[in-house]
């Protein structure tokens, strides 16, 4: 999954306990509530490693955001805490209980509005926008050479439909701010520009709405110039791990590269007490590379099962074209069995799964 | 304007060698790129291959692979299609196109465009 | 390979007439769809991209819908120079592959 920087959660000071696998859970909380929202195992068996979800965007753990394995905690709700929350087996990323989450002005009275008041006569439960495909919205990067033609979409749903608009840096973008216009598509919540130029450098973000929640996803556009490049890594990925022992990890590492590029993951390793030879080079192995049935999305994902302190380290994404290498590392901090509820650190995500 | 036009088609023996080139101005395709498509008399399109000048690769159609090879002469604003081991199932009017990418974060691909096409030039294989 | 089939293979129709034509790709294309005409002994001219969009300088009269396997191209009222041969094409499968074109024809 991605971890946004935009995404936060909400909550309310009692447990809600999560609908049936299939079922979404209309929930309606009051301005500064803190929120559990609870989702035990199906058929209370064993759930495995679990990850939560807001509009698509996987959840960084906080201090004001306490994820454990069948539990969100969250502190201090607000407006744009609104949306879709899921419960997903981490590995199938099969949804395990969703929840639509509405965060009002006023602090709640303790009792779940149901918005029926509200409610367009559709025959269909309201509810705040989400993202149909969240799978296809994890990729934030996209660089384009001159001259090409972008196009960004946010496929939403949500009762009543919402809305789509567009910001530029955050503010409103229209065809007039560009030379040649924009092309809009309301229905297929697309927005395109055609023979894009260097000017057209930017974040752009999406924000699909309607009258019970606000979604957003931001995409930065690089426009390149001239000549290829080697392999661009986006920015804060891989990201640092707290894991308990035993449980699993993944790192990411998004890749862009005009030419082919060739992704490895390497651990950094000692020889004879050293972590670099003669030559400064660090002592790495590799622990994936390209095979002849492996994709770049499967090679952009690095899993670590069942860790163990040995696993605790360094970890290289490393990604080469004709051109050249691009490297982005993180490291593993592997605790000993404690909590299922614990809290993360600045160093990055915390899973006890 | 945008303008492309294609050359050195001409008739040639089966097994036989042609080189076509398609000299573009208007615009560079340092960014973007050129695709060759063909049409055998009286049927439909086929596409051939492409170069993708931004990164020098280039694609085909299973049908070519091994035989044709597109290339560019930048400073030229260039590209050719060099046609070895011609088949009778080679006889077609070829047209070279200039192509533009979509590219679709969302939908994790690029899409292929042919947006300015040049006037074709016949290559007929037969003994 | 994807195979694009369209349908009808050619028609008749009277300038003013609305046409439809539908082209159908053998697996998911997602939106990656381009439409093409071409008249006898002329180059292609694009139509429209990604599905739905109109290429620059294409008449307003033309439109493209669709999305997976289903697409289908509109002309809204058809005029004397919109007689040709009609070809969908996509490119989000290698290698790109065009459908056997329609013909459209004047009654």
């Known amino acids: 999954e991605s971890l946004g920087t935009e995404q936060r959660v909400v909550g309310r000071a009692a447990e809600v306990p999560g609908p049936e696998p299939g079922q979404q859970e209309q929930l309606v909380f009051g301005s500064g509530d803190a929120v559990e929202l609870s989702c035990p195992p199906p058929g209370g068996g064993p759930m495995g490693p679990t990850v939560w979800v807001k509009d698509g965007t996987g959840l960084v753990p906080s201090e004001r955001v306490l994820v454990g394995p069948q539990r969100l905690q969250v502190l201090n709700a607000s407006h744009e805490d609104s949306g879709a929350y899921s419960c997903r087996q981490r590995l199938t990323q099969r949804v395990l209980c969703h929840f639509s989450v509405r965060v009002t002005d006023a602090p709640s009275s303790g009792d779940d509005e149901d918005g029926e008041d509200e409610a367009e006569d559709t025959g269909v439960d309201t509810g705040a926008p989400y993202w149909t495909r969240p799978e296809r919205m994890d990729k934030k990067l996209l660089a384009v050479p001159a001259a090409n033609t972008v196009r960004f979409r946010c496929p939403a749903a949500g009762n009543p439909t919402p809305s789509i608009s567009w910001l530029k840096n955050g503010r409103e973008f229209r065809g007039e701010h560009r030379i040649g216009g924009i092309k809009l598509r309301h229905q297929q919540w697309s927005l395109v520009m055609e023979s894009v130029v260097p000017s057209d450098r930017g974040n752009y973000t999406c924000v699909v709405e309607n009258k019970f929640g606000s979604i957003r996803q931001t995409y930065t556009l690089d426009v390149l110039e001239r000549s290829p490049h080697r392999p661009i890594l986006q920015a804060g990925l891989p990201a640092n791990q707290t894991a308990v022992l035993g449980s699993d990890v993944e790192f990411h590492c998004k890749v862009y590269s005009d030419a082919q590029p060739h992704i490895q993951w390497l651990k950094h390793v000692e020889v004879n007490g050293s972590k670099v030879g003669p030559d400064g080079t660090p002592y790495v192995t590799v622990l994936k590379t390209a095979g002849a049935n492996t994709t770049d999305k499967e090679l952009e994902v690095l899993s670590l099962h069942n860790v163990t302190f040995e696993d605790a380290g360094e970890y290289t994404c490393l990604a080469g074209n004709s051109i050249g290498f691009s490297h982005h590392s993180a490291w593993l901090v592997v605790l000993p069995a404690e909590e299922e509820l614990v809290e993360a650190d600045e160093a990055g995500s915390v899973y006890a799964g | 304007e945008v303008q492309l036009v294609e050359s050195g088609g001409g008739l040639v023996q089966p097994g036989g060698s042609l080189r076509l080139s398609c000299a573009a101005s208007g615009f560079t395709f340092t960014s973007t790129g050129i695709s060759w498509v063909r049409q055998a008399p009286g049927k439909g399109l086929e596409w051939v291959g492409r170069y993708w000048a931004w990164d020098g690769s280039t694609n085909y159609a299973d049908s070519v692979k091994g035989r044709f090879t597109i290339s560019a002469d930048t400073s030229k604003n260039t590209a050719y299609l060099q046609m070895n081991s011609l088949r009778a199932e080679d006889t077609a009017v070829y047209y070279c196109a200039r192509t533009y990418g979509i590219y679709d974060i969302y939908g994790g691909y690029t899409e292929y465009v042919m947006d300015y096409w040049g006037q074709g030039t016949l290559v007929t294989v037969s003994s | 390979d994807i195979q694009m089939t369209q349908s009808p293979s050619s028609l008749s129709a009277s300038v003013g007439d609305r046409v439809t034509i539908t082209c159908r790709a053998s697996q998911d294309v997602d939106t990656s769809l381009a439409w093409y005409k071409q008249k006898p002994g002329k180059a292609p001219k694009l139509l429209i991209y990604?599905?739905?969009f109109l290429y620059s300088g294409v008449p307003s009269r033309f439109s493209g819908s669709g999305s997976g396997t289903d697409f289908t191209l509109t002309i809204s009222s058809l005029q004397p120079e919109d007689f040709a041969t009609y070809y969908c094409q996509q490119s989000t499968g290698h290698p790109q592959t065009f459908g056997q074109g329609t013909k459209v024809e004047i009654k």
């Open positions: 990604s599905a739905s």
